[in-house]
């Protein structure tokens, strides 16, 4: 562990209450193929424990979705991954809209610091799939 | 090689016969920019030779595709990456539908074990592109 | 740095003049969360300084875009990442079309050599977003 190979892959636990756009994550071998090796979960949000540059990746699929169902909704459904705390470091890191699709997937390199908590905000009224092969979120430490 | 930096990037060789949804892959410098360094191919399917956590990534583009042509077909086209053998470890790791798009691309971290064979199943009747910059599949060992 | 952990994450600076489909990138902590550690920029294009296998990733979002605005244009908007110089190594590495979507995102493993310059060509007449969480391009050295 001292090598700094911090890594995590999470599966969706649940969405937040009505006014909370955050997705709540869970991880651990007992749950399937998700795991946390270094980072930790704080009330379903991922907290970084080691400074460095990380590869952050995410895939979110909307539940019982067809290409028409996404575009039928007035407010476009958008997924944003960002640092939500500490407040002084709050920033959006990655943002995608679903438009006429049912899945978004992306990845990026970004510097993160010990204590940064990452939030994944899903705006709109569509429920994400909890299937572990359709919705997942992970980080991988890649260098100091 | 003893460092465990197993890595592979494959290009599409061909699709399977009618009742076989699997994509068959090929790799090697003679073919272009694909390669296998550690993992191996078994009848076009990727076999893992070292335990660890891997970053699995894939992009598949449908041949001669327009956004209308995908939705014109009755059965939605879906791509699933999973462990197909040994049977005791069979599981879907990553799944995406094309909906009104012509390309899916995603990636995830997952634990894999020596002997795991990964299959990429394309359901539906649409032929994928064989262009090496449009359709590819790869894995990268990232930590024990 | 001698470990060979070359890495870069870039944000969009500007598009090229009318007949130049290339996107021009910029990077550095003063600009936000972009950085160059090893690779360098040559007139907005990313140049590799160390041989190896790299994970190349990109996300491009079209500006003020809706799912209809992309499909309304006769010429589909396509993003291609490739080696553009030296000419002897020119090749397309990764290609995606927007179709009815507003964002493309993908990644792949590819061998790159010192001196390779990567270009990201956006064909069509649509302007990409310069928001740093919507459009970004990066590479990560992963092994020799």
């Amino acid at each position: 562990e001292s090598l700094g190979w911090d890594i995590a892959e999470l599966q969706l636990n649940h969405t937040g209450p009505q006014q909370d756009p955050r997705l709540y994550w869970q991880g651990g071998p007992a749950l399937g193929r998700s795991f946390l090796r270094g980072p930790e979960l704080d009330k379903g949000q991922l907290r970084i424990r080691r400074d460095g540059i990380y590869m952050v990746h995410i895939q979110v699929t909307l539940a019982i979705c067809s290409s028409t169902s996404t575009s039928r909704h007035h407010h476009p459904t958008t997924l944003a991954v960002g640092i939500c705390s500490p407040a002084s470091r709050s920033i959006s890191l990655l943002r995608l809209s679903f438009h006429q699709g049912c899945t978004i997937a992306s990845q990026r390199l970004t510097p993160l610091a010990r204590g940064d908590t990452l939030c994944t905000n899903l705006t709109g009224t569509l429920l994400p799939s909890r299937n572990t092969d359709e919705t997942f979120f992970g980080v991988q430490w890649v260098r100091p | 090689e003893s460092l465990g930096w197993d890595i592979a990037e494959l290009q599409l060789n061909h699709t399977g016969p009618q009742q076989d949804p699997r994509l068959y892959w090929q790799g090697g410098p003679a073919l272009g920019r694909s390669f296998l360094r550690g993992p191996e191919l078994d009848k076009g399917q990727l076999r893992i030779r070292r335990d660890g956590i891997y970053m699995v990534h894939i992009q598949v583009t449908l041949a001669i595709c327009s956004s209308t042509s995908t939705s014109r077909h009755h059965h939605p086209t879906t791509l699933a990456v999973g462990i197909c053998s040994p049977a005791s470890r069979s599981i879907s790791l990553l799944r995406l539908s094309f909906h009104q798009g012509c390309t899916i691309a995603s990636q995830r971290l997952t634990p894999l074990a020596r002997g795991d064979t990964l299959c990429t199943n394309l359901t539906g009747t649409l032929l994928p592109s064989r262009n090496t910059d449009e359709t590819f599949f790869g894995v990268q060992w990232v930590r024990p | 740095e001698s470990l060979g952990w070359d890495i870069a994450e870039l944000q969009l600076n500007h598009t090229g003049p009318q007949q130049d489909p290339r996107l021009y990138w910029q990077g550095g902590p003063a600009l936000g969360r972009s950085f160059l550690r090893g690779p360098e920029l040559d007139k907005g294009q990313l140049r590799i300084r160390r041989d190896g296998i790299y994970m190349v990733h990109i996300q491009v979002t079209l500006a003020i875009c809706s799912s209809t605005s992309t499909s309304r244009h006769h010429h589909p908007t396509t993003l291609a990442v490739g080696i553009c110089s030296p000419a002897s190594r020119s090749i397309s590495l990764l290609r995606l079309s927007f179709h009815q979507g507003c964002t493309i995102a993908s990644q792949r493993l590819t061998p790159l050599a010192r001196g390779d310059t990567l270009c990201t060509n956006l064909t069509g007449t649509l302007l990409p977003s310069r928001n740093t969480d919507e459009t970004f391009f990066g590479v990560q050295w992963v092994r020799p």
């Epitope: - | 041949a63 939705s71 009755h74 009747t125 649409l126 994928p128 064989r130 | -």
Partner: antibody, heavy 120, light 111 residues
Framework: QVQLQQSGPGLVQPSQSLSITCTVS????????VHWVRQSPGKGLEWLGV???????DYNAAFISRLSISKDNSKSQVFFKMNSLQADDTAIYYC??????????????WGQGTSVTVSS | DIVLTQSPASLAVSLGQRATISCRAS??????????MHWYQQKAGQPPKLLIY???NLESGVPARFSGRGSGTDFTLNIHPVEEGDAATYYC?????????FGAGTKLEIK
């Protein structure tokens, strides 16, 4: 086994319409597309249009104003209708199944053909 | 529309010899790593029969004496060795885009 059986008139009056039914067996219209092609000594083989597995259609632009293709999946029937026929529409009309790959438009099974003469 | 030009219009080949039929497209029919060109055989009084799809793929049940090759705009159908039952008219067809078009045909006679 796969079969496409065509039924329709042999003689059509000028300016009248042509209707042909293609009844299929051995495969499902919810999985395969069906094309219509005609053949005449003067123009050879001409592709007229296609009905996709979901029921949407594409037509040859030269015929789009007077051609209609529809189907009834439950009866395994595809219906072809062409309006305003003239003498140069005299041809053998075929229905044909698209091959398994939905984005490769080649035809692996054909009906026996309906020989149509346009004459008064 | 893509125009397909077949040559020759007719040919006579001795039993057991090779027959070569060409098809030239007015623009490339290549896309996505494939060549969208197909070949049919039609005997008198019968509908066309698919022989080759995607330039070189043999349709199920078609003898290996039939082979196709080519890319871009130039394609060939080869029959070797020719048998008596191969007397027919052969057509190429592209599916690179709509509308689909066919060549005018090449009539093969067995000597």
């Amino acid at each position: 086994q796969v079969q496409l059986q065509q039924s329709g008139p042999g003689l059509v009056q000028p300016s009248q319409s042509l209707s042909i039914t293609c009844t299929v067996s051995g495969f499902s219209l919810t999985t395969y597309a069906v094309h219509w092609v005609r053949q005449s000594p003067g123009k050879g083989l001409e592709w007229l249009g296609v009905i996709w597995s979901v029921g949407s259609t594409d037509y040859n632009a030269a015929f789009i104003s007077r051609l209609s293709i529809s189907k009834d999946n439950s009866k395994s029937q595809v219906f072809f209708k062409m309006n305003s026929l003239q003498a140069d529409d005299t041809a053998i009309y075929y229905c044909a199944r698209n091959i398994y790959y939905g984005n490769v438009y080649a035809m692996d099974y054909w009906g026996q053909g309906t020989s149509v003469t346009v004459s008064s | 529309d893509i125009v397909l030009t077949q040559s020759p219009a007719s040919l006579a080949v001795s039993l057991g010899q090779r027959a070569t039929i060409s098809c030239r497209a007015s623009k490339s029919v290549d896309a996505s790593g494939y060549s969208f060109m197909h070949w049919y055989q039609q005997k008198a009084g019968q509908p066309p029969k698919l022989l080759i799809y995607l330039a070189s793929n043999l349709e199920s049940g078609v003898p290996a004496r039939f082979s196709g090759r080519g890319s871009g705009t130039d394609f060939t159908l080869n029959i070797h060795p020719v048998e008596e039952g191969d007397a027919a008219t052969y057509y190429c067809q592209h599916s690179r885009e709509l509308p689909l078009t066919f060549g005018a045909g090449t009539k093969l006679e067995i000597k």
